[in-house]
């Protein structure tokens, strides 16, 4: 029951975690910059994410712009976009393959073969997790120096959006998710040898004379 | 002490492009925050930025002669330059370089003047 | 770009006097991020270079006498003279350095 139960919670949090990557991966806030304008009225806010970029007036009106050119792109932006929608897609793969080795589905029959392929899905949330993590980390990276670069005037200075944290605690479900997964897999084999080998029991050998122990007979 | 000193022709040709070099002592170009600001001033005129280069590469240069100036460095020599292609009577000016700190110019130089004649 | 507007363009006053003059920006140099204004003054005495007087609006760079005073915010500014000095005898430019390209108004001139 403890292993199902590991296995449950490990796919929640992975699910989770998952959604909010998908979130991530869509929202315009990567980075944010606050223009205060000459007054309340004119106050704006700039977002930038990896499909689009947008500007939120304070009287709540929002325009958003596409980008449409993939070569005007910057690499960073190219490479986020590459690395966070091949998590994405790596998470969906995670899916099935985590629920073909759970004990409550028949897609593998029981066994250590079915072991193998939950601890699989858990390794792959683990992968997703850390393969998201490398662009959202690599973008603050980013942000942060740019930030205090004295090149960069204060108009170009942008902060870290909301997009980045959603991502972040996506990726933590993710990897939290997928070590439960691996943890329940274990568990379910009772620690088994990695390699899952066939144990047999040797039959007794006949004495020389060819006759059997009388023991062995009632 | 910052010093910079502006070194050109003096006078060159319409078409001809314009070499300038900034020769500075009292600060380094590899030194993180530094940069050097290129601007003119037309005589009986106002002040017009043309470039910065910094001590990481980054350059930032005015839209408007966007597609005729080059900047550049050469820190080991202590040395900065702008390079202003197709020259006409209107680039007749001052040009002076300037050390900055951020985006202000704390440090300039004496200027040189530049004249556009044929 | 942001374009920067002086007025007046030449103002003619006496030693001791007080002397104020305006720079206006085409747009807010306020950066909400520290609240701070991104304008800056230059003097430049006939036949010098410029020297940096002020920054962040308000801001002395050192060295500079305390009868210079910056104020305004977002799109006015003001520099003022508390009493003119025959020294101060100059051009007067403001810039902004909020954003690039740096730009500059087209300078007030002041004479003694």
């Known amino acids: 029951m403890g292993s199902a139960a590991l296995e449950i919670l490990g796919l929640v949090l992975c699910l989770v975690g998952w959604g909010g990557l998908i979130l991530a991966c869509a929202l315009p806030q990567w980075r944010i910059y606050s223009y205060a304008g000459d007054n309340i009225v004119t106050a704006q806010a700039m977002y930038e994410g990896l499909w689009m970029s947008c500007v939120s007036q304070s009287t709540g009106q929002i325009q958003c712009k596409v980008f449409d050119s993939l070569l005007n792109l910057s690499s960073t932006v190219q490479a986020a976009r590459a690395l966070t929608v091949s998590a994405v897609l790596l998470a969906f793969v995670a899916l099935f393959v985590t629920l073909a080795g759970a004990q409550c589905t028949t897609c593998v029959a029981p066994g250590p073969a079915k072991a193998r392929v939950a601890l699989t899905g858990g390794v792959l949330y683990l992968f997703c997790g850390l393969l998201a993590l490398v662009p959202l980390c690599w973008f603050a990276n980013i942000v942060v120096r740019e930030f205090y670069d004295p090149s960069v005037p204060v108009s170009q200075k942008y902060e870290l959006g909301a997009a980045l944290y959603i991502g972040w605690a996506a990726t933590a479900l993710l990897m939290v998710g997928g070590c439960l997964l691996c943890c329940g897999a274990w568990v379910c084999t009772g620690r088994p040898d990695l390699s899952f080998p066939v144990k047999y029991s040797a039959p007794r050998r006949p004495t020389a004379t060819g006759d059997y122990d009388k023991k062995n007979y009632v | 002490q910052v010093t910079l000193k502006e070194s050109g022709p003096g006078i060159l040709q319409p078409s001809h492009t314009l070499s300038l070099t900034c020769s500075f002592s009292?600060?380094?170009?590899?030194?993180?925050?530094?940069?050097v600001n290129w601007i003119r001033q037309p005589s009986g005129k106002g002040l017009e930025w043309l470039a910065s280069?910094?001590?990481?590469?980054?350059?930032y240069i005015n839209p408007s002669l966007k597609n005729r100036l080059t900047v550049s460095k050469d820190p080991s020599n202590n040395q900065a330059f702008l390079e202003v292609t197709n020259v006409d009577p209107a680039d007749t000016a001052t040009y002076y370089c300037?050390?900055?700190?951020?985006?202000?110019?704390?440090?300039w130089g004496q200027g040189v003047m530049v004249t556009v004649s044929s | 770009d942001i374009v920067m507007t002086q007025t007046p363009s030449s103002q003619a006053v006496s030693a001791g006097e007080k002397v104020t003059m305006s720079c206006k920006s085409s747009?807010?140099?306020?950066?909400?991020?520290?609240?701070?204004?991104?304008l800056a003054w230059y003097q430049q005495k006939p036949g010098q270079s410029p020297k940096l007087l002020i920054y962040?609006?308000?801001t002395r760079e050192s060295g500079v006498p305390d009868r210079f005073i910056g104020s305004g915010s977002g799109t006015d500014f003001t520099l003022t003279i508390s009493s003119v000095q025959a020294e101060d005898l100059a051009d007067y430019y403001c810039?902004?350095?909020?954003?690039?390209?740096?730009?500059f108004g087209s300078g007030t001139k002041l004479e003694i």
């Open positions: 747009q807010s140099l306020l950066y909400s991020g520290d609240q701070k204004n991104y």
């Open positions: 962040l609006t308000s």
């Open positions: 280069i910094w001590w990481h590469g980054k350059t």
């Open positions: 300037a050390h900055a700190r951020a985006q202000l110019l704390d440090y």
């Open positions: 009292g600060f380094s170009l590899n030194t993180y925050g530094v940069g």
């Open positions: 810039q902004q350095h909020y954003s690039y390209p740096l730009t």
